[in-house]
């Protein structure tokens, strides 16, 4: 029996291939055992790692993972080549920068070992599983009495990614948010000078590049405010 | 920050030549594929050439022959070397960075103001 199921996990032209056995008897064979699910996620295009729960197998498997790239020039079959460990059994693989082609559609493939016919394939869009690094070197400068502007950089292209800037002062309960675009520049025109103000940012590879739905780590949180505008009323970076 | 930075455009008859160079940071070059737009008042952004990390090229039909693309790693700086200027040549050029491969395997339509300034490209006949 040769069964194909649809596995979507929001990572659109997803499958997995399970290779099931009929046995004679009642009971099936670890074959009919489903691996788990891959995940992968490219970190600002520096490394992936693809990684799957190890504890989800009835007893400890150290599972192999191949991975090629369909229709394209790098469609040969390559084996893991560095392996990520939970308590001494395989549970994911670190690809570098080089064997990373975000435009090409990735195929990976658990595969048991002590099994071979158990094995799972998953097609993956790369460009849509990155993750930035958060952003840095945030800065703020004061436009007029009332203005102020927030900038930072990111250590990737910058029109390849989108932001979301989140505000507070030591008054409020909740964060205010604004979305920014590749611009990366956000503007508060209206400050009130008796309140202390905390910023922070982070950013998504979407929607020029790619169409990643995984946000970055927040950036350091920046203050400004009461007990510290005036030390320099015109510009302030300092981190928490 | 500023990440990528444009050079070498001017004013040229007809038939002349100009290099425009285009420095970035090295986080960017190095990972990156790299392309030349431009844009001429009233018209769309347009794709003139590219140049991948592994070196190669792709020119629009109107510059084949008359353009080059050329990357030097070293100084992480493209260059486009146009010959044989043409009037409809007149634009303000824009340098281009992409994630590797996206030219090849991804492409889609850019707006000229993802980049930098630019740098004007004059051709009178």
């Known amino acids: 029996l040769n069964t194909t199921i649809l596995t979507p996990n929001g990572n659109e032209d997803t499958t997995a291939d399970f290779f099931l056995t009929t046995m004679p008897t009642d009971s099936l064979s670890v074959s009919t055992l489903p691996l788990p699910e891959v995940q992968c996620f490219v970190f600002n295009v520096e490394y992936m790692n693809c990684t799957w729960n190890s504890s989800s197998e009835p007893q400890p498997t150290n599972l192999t993972l191949h991975y090629w790239y369909k229709n394209s020039d790098n469609d040969k079959v390559q084996k893991c080549s560095h392996y990520l460990f939970s308590e001494e059994i395989t549970s994911g693989c670190q690809l570098q920068k080089k064997e990373i082609h975000l435009y090409q559609t990735f195929v990976v493939q658990l595969q048991d070992p002590r099994e071979p016919r158990r094995q799972a394939t998953q097609m993956l869009k790369l460009q849509n599983l990155v993750i930035p690094w958060a952003p840095e070197n945030l800065t703020l400068h004061k436009l007029s009495e009332s203005q102020l502007e927030l900038n930072w950089n990111n250590r990737f292209l910058n029109h390849c990614l989108e932001h979301l800037v989140q505000y507070r002062t030591d008054w409020d309960h909740s964060w205010t948010e604004q979305s920014v675009d590749y611009r990366h520049k956000f503007s508060l025109p209206s400050v009130d000078g008796q309140k202390r103000y905390t910023f922070r940012v982070r950013s998504r590879f979407n929607p020029l590049c790619g169409s990643a739905q995984h946000w970055s780590e927040w950036s350091h949180p920046i203050h400004w405010g009461s007990n510290t505008s005036k030390e320099n009323p015109f510009l302030f970076a300092l981190e928490a | 920050q500023v990440q990528l930075q444009e050079s070498g455009g001017g004013s040229v008859q007809a038939g002349g030549s100009l290099r425009l160079s285009c420095t970035a940071s090295?986080?960017?070059?190095?990972?990156?594929?790299m392309g030349w737009y431009r844009q001429a008042p009233g018209n769309e952004c347009e794709l003139v050439s590219t140049?991948?990390?592994?070196?190669?090229?792709y020119y629009a039909d109107s510059v084949k022959g008359r353009f080059t693309i050329s990357r030097d790693n070293a100084k992480n700086t493209v260059y486009l070397q146009m010959n044989s200027l043409k009037p409809e040549d007149t634009a303000v050029y824009y340098c281009?960075?992409?994630?590797?491969?996206?030219?090849?395997?991804?492409?889609?339509?850019?707006?000229?103001?993802?980049w930098g300034q630019g740098t004007q490209v004059t051709v009178s006949s």
């Open positions: 140049i991948s990390s592994d070196g190669s090229t």
């Open positions: 281009a960075a992409e994630p590797r491969g996206y030219y090849s395997n991804y492409g889609g339509r850019r707006e000229c103001n993802y």
């Open positions: 090295r986080f960017i070059f190095d990972d990156s594929d």
